[in-house]
């Protein structure tokens, strides 16, 4: 426990000490207290430097003094023979011996008291930053008039921080500026404007004068603004350093103004005002702004339109443009958004064609549509090419955007007919050289297709069955070729209004008008054994002439069989009508005179005994056409005749081509897209 | 040249089993209906047994329905008679036939264009 | 089932002779009905189909008519190796069955 005062004495005092002793003593006053030692009896022997025996005085790490000897009052009026005076309140005391002494000593007594010590001017630091006041055990800070004492009892400084300023205009300075400001200060003030608006600060270089920076280019005194994670400063020196005018993209600005204990200037003057909080003129790639201006504030609203080719994406809907305003944190709302490529999506397929996958479906993209060749093309032109438009659609230089169409090629065979020997009288031939030669089974028939939803056949062939059953694709009508072929399925059967129904069909004797249309459920997909035969042209160049040759097909009575179990054909010249007049009926049904004979009708036949027969009917009697060799047209249809192996009856296509094309645009389906 | 080739004929006691096989070449069989015809000794013809093209239809006559199976091996060309629960009555020479099947759903058929040699079956005890 | 009545049953002719083989069906059967020539030890052969069809390979001198119920095979001038015993053959529906046949002989 501290003691205001103690005696030392070394051991045996008075008597003589012994021999190698070490004895310390822990002296310890009251905090706020120095102490003052002295010595009133030193007995001790002597040696340089007392190196034998001593008493030494510590305080802290110092040595205070180091006694040996003997010592004598200087001062009759006083009993003390040495002093210290230290302005702390712990002291050691170490008492030290050797082994031997030549003669008898008897030590020292000493005693310690408190004594006060002045804070305020025994130190090289001066604790008080303006005044010091001692007093016994202890001192106290003071400050000068408008200065205010800090928390730590010491520091004096300006009561400067507090301010808030919230006008959209104003001024600030330093303490007392023009006047030097206070030292060891710190000045806080707060500029909050309304939301929207940032804090703008201007200063004039000569408004500004702070203790300089050290050699280690650190601010002694400093000021500072602090704009949200935003810091300008620190700022010091003769003349402001930093930009003249700062735009802190803020609405609270905080300036902080740091001065130490030395050095003080004049500090400085600054203006601040709130501009509208500007949002940056963004580059938004592929758009345009409107307005168009140099600079955009708080509240401003843009349109941003896309140029073409370019939509925002928001969701699943796309827009052309989009309203975006300058918001109060300076940002701009709606700032995801952005002008993309139009994406055209990828193109529809077509029936009976095909698009390569788009390397890209973007604005500006190509694609390329084509028919499965050579079985299709494009009907409606324009080539097929296509590029994604700015609406977003796939569109096409002719069509626009419609799509193409892809539509049989017709009366091209994939294998020509040849003649290999001497249908009556004709040769074996393959369906791929009359693809468009269609098998009715009942009654054992033909017919021709004429496109993908339309079977053209003689009006004979299906007045008793309106639901024929019909295949394509086989050579032979054997029931298992036909189960592997493509059965076609009727929807309607439209016959000729001139057509005559009767009740008992076997003893017609008029044939007049003998055509039909067979409507199909489902379209047929073309390939090298189906595909359609053509029509004739309206014009002079598709009228017949005798000698004109013509190619029939089918699989009827032959010289061998009554129904011939794979297709045969027959070249067969055009012939005047009287050659078939002139020709006695087989098994007559009634007076020959009663068979009618009509500019509907076409014969031909008479060479090497070929001829259409029973079974054959409906099927086509397919002629070159004279504007394009490489296709056949269906000029006749095989209807009747008065004897097999001589000559034949046709229905003439080209008298019925109006009631043809009337029929199958009345009758078709819209295509479901 | 179109040919037909029966074989597995025998004889065999009441009650007991045989499997008639008919192999075809010189045509493309599964083209083709087939029938059974067989000739009891000093009798006339008595047909058996037909199978469409592709053996999803059968025929058979009363007198053997329900101990008679005629099947087809498209692959392996060939036309067989299963014989079960044989009778003395089954004694015959079987001959195997081809049939000629022509049409689609409305079908027009031309039997027996085309006749085997025949394999004798003898029923005994 | 439909029963097929061949008459005669037999007869004697002479080379040369036109000879005529009737079928009678139970039942109506179209023009569904082939005739078959059938010499001993041998398989029969197919003369005619659907009635009234030559098949491919027969002398013309073989013919056939009729339709319904009533049918005729006809050799217009017997030849020595038409000695045979001829059956009729309905095919009209299930189950297929033959005429008893007829047997021709030289007289």
């Known amino acids: 426990e501290p003691t205001m005062y103690g005696e030392i004495l070394s051991p045996n005092y008075p008597q003589a000490y012994p021999s190698e002793v070490e004895k310390s003593w822990d002296i310890e006053v009251p905090e706020g207290y120095g102490i003052h030692l002295y010595f009133t009896h030193l007995d001790i022997e002597l040696s340089e430097n007392c190196a034998y025996d001593s008493v030494q005085i510590i305080s802290g790490d110092t040595e205070e003094g180091r006694l040996c000897g003997q010592r004598s009052s200087n001062n009759p009026h006083s009993p003390i023979v040495e002093e210290f005076q230290v302005p702390y309140n712990k002291l050691q005391v170490i008492f030290k011996s050797d082994f031997s002494n030549e003669e008898r000593f008897t030590g020292f007594a000493a005693y310690y008291v408190a004594t006060d010590i002045n804070e305020c001017t025994d130190f090289v630091d001066v604790p008080c930053s303006h005044f010091c006041n001692n007093f016994i055990g202890g001192y106290f800070c003071s400050c000068p008039p408008e200065y205010f004492l800090h928390d730590d009892m010491k520091n004096c400084g300006v009561n400067c921080s507090g301010d808030v300023f919230t006008a959209l205009i104003g001024e600030i300075a330093s303490p007392n500026y023009p006047k030097p400001y206070p030292e060891n200060s710190r000045c806080e003030y707060q500029i909050r404007l309304e939301k929207g608006f940032q804090v703008v600060v201007t200063l004039r270089r000569e408004d500004f004068d702070v203790e300089a920076a050290d050699s280690a280019g650190n601010c002694l005194d400093s000021l500072v603004f602090v704009a949200g994670d935003r810091q300008f400063g620190p700022y010091c020196g003769h003349g402001f350093p930093g930009p003249l005018n700062i735009e802190t993209k803020s609405n609270a600005l905080d300036i902080i103004f740091q001065t130490d204990l030395t050095g003080q200037k004049k500090g400085w003057k600054l203006r601040y005002h709130g501009d509208p909080m500007p949002c940056p003129k963004e580059d938004t790639p592929n758009s345009v702004w409107e307005p168009a201006k140099a600079k955009y504030v708080f509240r401003d609203v843009v349109q941003i339109t896309c140029l073409d080719g370019f939509e925002v994406v928001e969701g699943r809907v796309g827009a052309t443009s989009f309203y975006s305003t300058c918001q109060s944190n300076g940002k701009w709302s709606n700032s995801k958004l952005k002008c993309q490529p139009v994406d055209c999506g990828i193109p529809e397929s077509i029936e009976n064609g095909k698009v390569e996958d788009p390397e890209s479906t973007l604005f500006g993209s190509v694609i390329r549509y084509t028919c499965e060749e050579p079985y299709y093309y494009m009907e409606n032109g324009g080539g097929g090419e296509y590029h994604c438009a700015g609406n977003g659609s796939w569109v096409n230089e002719v069509l626009g955007p419609e799509l193409p169409k892809c539509v049989p090629v017709c009366g091209v065979p994939r294998e020509p007919f040849e003649e290999k020997q001497r249908i009556i009288g004709g040769s074996d031939a393959d369906i791929k050289n009359f693809p468009w030669q269609v098998f009715f089974d009942n009654p054992w028939a033909g017919g021709a297709l004429i496109n993908e939803y339309w079977v053209l056949t003689a009006a004979h062939v299906v007045e008793g069955n309106r639901e024929p059953t019909m295949y394509v694709g086989s050579t032979s009508v054997q029931t298992s070729r036909l189960a592997k072929s493509k059965m076609l399925t009727p929807e309607h059967v439209f016959i000729h209004p001139g057509w005559k129904l009767l009740e008992v069909p076997e003893g017609r004797t008029n044939f007049d008008n003998d055509i039909a249309l067979v409507r199909l459920k489902d379209p047929v997909k073309m390939g090298p054994t189906v595909s359609p035969i053509c029509l004739p042209g309206t014009s002079s160049d598709y009228n017949l002439m005798d000698g004109d040759l013509g190619l029939i097909s089918g699989w009827g009575r032959t010289e061998k069989r009554d129904r011939a179990v794979r297709l045969k054909a027959a070249r067969l010249p055009v012939a005047p009508l009287r050659k078939c007049k002139e020709v006695k009926v087989e098994k007559p049904t009634a007076d020959a005179e009663a068979y009618v004979f009509t500019p509907n009708m076409i014969c031909a036949g008479g060479e090497k005994g070929m001829d259409s027969c029973k079974g054959d009917s409906g099927g086509a009697f397919a002629v070159q056409d004279p504007n394009d060799k490489t296709k056949f047209y269906a000029a006749g249809l095989v209807s009747w005749g008065p004897q097999c192996g001589t000559y034949g009856l046709y229905t003439r296509v080209k008298n019925y081509v109006d009631w043809i094309m009337k029929t199958m645009q009345e009758n078709s389906t819209p295509r479901e897209d | 040249e179109v040919q037909l080739v029966e074989s597995g004929g025998g004889v065999v006691r009441p009650g007991g089993s045989l499997r008639l096989s008919c192999a075809a070449s010189?045509?493309?069989?599964?083209?083709?209906?087939m029938s059974w015809v067989r000739q009891a000794p000093g009798k006339g013809l008595e047909w058996v047994s037909g199978?469409?093209?592709?053996?999803?239809?059968?025929g058979y006559a009363d007198s053997v329905k329900g101990r008679f199976t005629i099947s087809r091996d498209n692959a392996k060309n060939s036309l067989y008679l299963q014989m079960n629960s044989l009778r003395a009555e089954d004694t015959a020479l079987y001959y195997c036939?081809?049939?000629?099947?022509?049409?689609?759903?409305?079908?027009?058929?031309?039997?027996?264009?085309?006749w085997g040699k025949g394999t004798t079956v003898t029923v005994s005890s | 089932d439909i029963q097929m009545t061949q008459s005669p049953s037999s007869l004697s002719a002479s080379v040369g002779d036109r000879v005529t083989i009737t079928c009678r069906a139970s039942?109506?059967?179209?023009?569904?009905l082939g005739w078959y020539q059938q010499k001993p030890g041998k398989a029969p052969k197919r003369l005619i189909y659907?009635?009234?069809n030559l098949q491919s390979g027969v002398p013309s001198r073989f013919s056939g008519s009729g339709s319904g119920t009533e049918f005729t095979l006809t050799i217009s001038s017997l030849q020595p190796e038409d000695f045979a015993t001829y059956y009729c053959?309905?095919?009209?529906?299930?189950?297929?069955?033959f005429g008893g046949g007829t047997k021709v002989e030289i007289k």
């Open positions: 036939a081809r049939d000629e099947q022509l049409g689609g759903k409305y079908y027009y058929y031309y039997y027996m264009d085309v």
């Open positions: 010189g045509f493309t069989f599964d083209d083709y209906g």
């Open positions: 659907t009635a009234s």
């Open positions: 053959l309905q095919y009209r529906s299930h189950p297929l069955t």
């Open positions: 199978i469409n093209w592709e053996g999803g239809s059968t």
């Open positions: 039942q109506g059967i179209r023009n569904d």
